[in-house]
């Protein structure tokens, strides 16, 4: 600033007479940066951190307050200070946060509240990482809190990280929390969900498990087809292609119920496209939807496939003809 000492001079500047802060209050908003540096005691600031948030300090005044705390706690802030950081949290770097030991869910909530409505910043990601590692696992209360603030949080974790989610935590997951999950993540989450919801009755179970089905194997889809679940097309389109391919026409018809008519609109998209190509034309014709497969209508041979990612492209490129 042109009208104040340079940073190197700030610490050497004495507090003007009568300006020494006795408490953290609104009068401090009129202090220049160098006056805050000279007149506010760091220990006083630390004990009255809860007041900082209630006072509309400017961006640059908050820089000074952070600097004072950094000097007071070079090894990292204690949780009593962290809990009351408020908007000062936005000034913390991931390096600052790595020095913290945050154990209280209330502290985590308070800091996430500050960042509410914004994308997950590197600071928040670091904070969550520190918190979860400190707890040893992603328990239900933590997951509840994190997905409330960041619906996409689960899908930002690697399959390895997701493996530490206990099945009991799955109860906190809402369908929208899984919107951006890829198949590898759902492969990890699905068995946990299956375990978590295993004691529910058929229709309730399907409502809960539905958003996890992108990780379900063929045998579970076959089992669901026997339960009149009426899966919608949006859910069907998210199923693993390798899990859908072995299903018979009858099983898919039972699985989808009245939604089976939607297959026609999706016939060019995976996994419907690839599943159609694997069916006998006679069987497809029973649906009365005009779906065109490429298999003959005679003997039904089940060929073994490696369900790798190249399979769909082979089907599409070569339009494999099936022979006896």
């Amino acid at each position: 600033d042109a009208a104040q000492p340079a940073a190197s001079e700030v610490e050497k500047t004495a507090c003007p007479s009568g300006k020494k802060a006795r408490e953290i209050d609104e009068s401090l908003i009129f202090y220049k940066k160098w006056e805050l540096e000279a007149c506010v005691d760091a220990a006083l600031l630390a004990t009255q951190m809860d007041r900082v948030n209630a006072i509309p300090f400017t961006y640059e005044q908050l820089d000074v307050l952070k600097h004072k705390l950094d000097e007071l706690y070079p090894q990292g802030y204690p949780e009593s200070v962290i809990q009351h950081l408020g908007y000062l949290f936005l000034k913390m770097s991931p390096e600052d946060i790595r020095k913290w030991n945050v154990t209280s869910l209330e502290t985590l909530k308070a800091l996430l509240e500050v960042n509410k409505g914004h994308e997950m910043s590197p600071q928040v990601a670091t904070l969550i990482d520190r918190f979860v590692k400190g707890r040893g696992q992603l328990d239900k209360d933590t997951l509840d809190t994190l997905t409330a603030f960041y619906p996409g949080y689960l899908c930002s974790l690697s399959p390895e990280e997701l493996s530490s989610v206990p099945p009991s935590s799955i109860w906190a997951v809402r369908p929208q929390d899984l919107d951006t999950c890829d198949p590898r993540q759902l492969d990890v989450l699905y068995p946990k969900a299956r375990l978590a919801f295993q004691n529910m009755n058929g229709s309730e179970y399907f409502v809960k498990i539905q958003s996890f089905l992108g990780g379900a194997p063929t045998e579970d889809l076959k089992a669901l087809s026997q339960q009149n679940v009426s899966m919608d097309l949006a859910t069907f389109m998210k199923l693993r292609t390798d899990a859908v391919l072995p299903l018979t026409v009858a099983e898919v018809q039972k699985l989808l119920g009245p939604h089976v008519e939607g297959l026609k609109a999706e016939e060019r998209h995976r996994p419907v496209r690839d599943w159609i190509l694997r069916q006998r034309q006679d069987d497809l014709d029973t649906l009365g939807l005009g779906l065109q497969g490429t298999r003959g209508s005679h003997h039904h041979h089940h060929h073994e496939f490696r369900h790798d990612s190249g399979l769909n492209d082979i089907f599409e490129a070569q339009k494999i003809e099936w022979h006896e």
Epitope: D1, A2, A3, D25, E26, I29, F30, K32, N53, A54, I55, P56, F57, T58, Y59, E60, Q61, L62, Y87, L88, L90, K91, V114
Partner: antibody
């Protein structure tokens, strides 16, 4: 949508006091600081002070210290600005304007009341 | 207190003109500067914040630039609705202060 609805015009005698209200709606009242800004006829804008609706903390520009009082009623999401010892130069349109509670990088006024004309005349 | 000086104080222009208004601060205000538009009998309306960020719902013909002590508001092609008075405001430090205003009228 966000609305700041101010009370009607006032005519006051020199030495009297005036109390202007500003009722907020369409957002979480306690998440935004409320400021008062005035504008004398044909003149520019002048910042008067601020109230934090959450805790009731107030800060006034030095020029108005001792004459200005800001209060709030969270039950009705209303803030009040009272200016005492009025003189003719206090004739102005008084605006309430909100600023989001943030890390200091957002202290611009994103919503304003419609303004209240206060005329001080003997 | 930080003084903000706007120039020119009055500007006559025609529809379609490119208009530039300057705001100078008496000391460094970093990027903590906003611009407002005010029409007669109305409250000011936020146009630009943080020196160059366009407020929600504001047409893209408005733009802001600058940092430190010198800032500009530019209207790339003046429209009939743009004839008004424009104010800058700093929020680097308290008290918050405004420039004296620039009135844009029809040539």
């Amino acid at each position: 949508q966000v609305q700041l609805q101010q009370s009607g015009a006032e005519v006051k005698k020199p030495g009297a006091s005036v109390k202007v209200s500003c009722k907020a709606s369409g957002y979480t009242f306690t998440n935004y600081y409320m400021h008062w800004v005035r504008q004398a006829p044909g003149q520019g804008l002048e910042w008067m002070g601020i109230i934090n609706p959450s805790g009731g903390y107030t800060t006034y520009a030095q020029k108005f210290q001792g004459r200005l009082t800001m209060t709030r009623d969270t039950s009705t999401s209303t803030v009040y600005m009272e200016l005492s010892s009025l003189r003719s130069e206090d004739t102005a349109v008084y605006y309430c304007a909100r600023i989001r509670s943030c890390g200091g990088d957002c202290y611009y006024f994103d919503n304003w009341g419609q303004g209240t004309l206060v005329t001080v005349s003997s | 207190d930080i003084q903000l000086t706007q120039s020119p104080s009055t500007l006559s222009a025609s529809v379609g003109d490119r208009v530039t208004i300057t705001c100078r601060a008496s000391e460094n205000v970093n990027i903590w500067l906003a611009w407002y538009q005010q029409k007669p009998g109305k409250a000011p309306k936020l146009l630009i914040y943080k020196s160059s960020s366009l407020a929600s719902g504001v047409p893209s013909r408005f733009s802001g630039s600058g940092s430190g002590a010198e800032f500009t508001l530019t209207i790339s092609s003046l429209q009939p609705d743009d004839f008004a008075t424009y104010y800058c405001q700093q929020y680097q430090s308290y008290p918050l202060t405004f420039g004296g205003g620039t009135k844009v009228d029809i040539k």
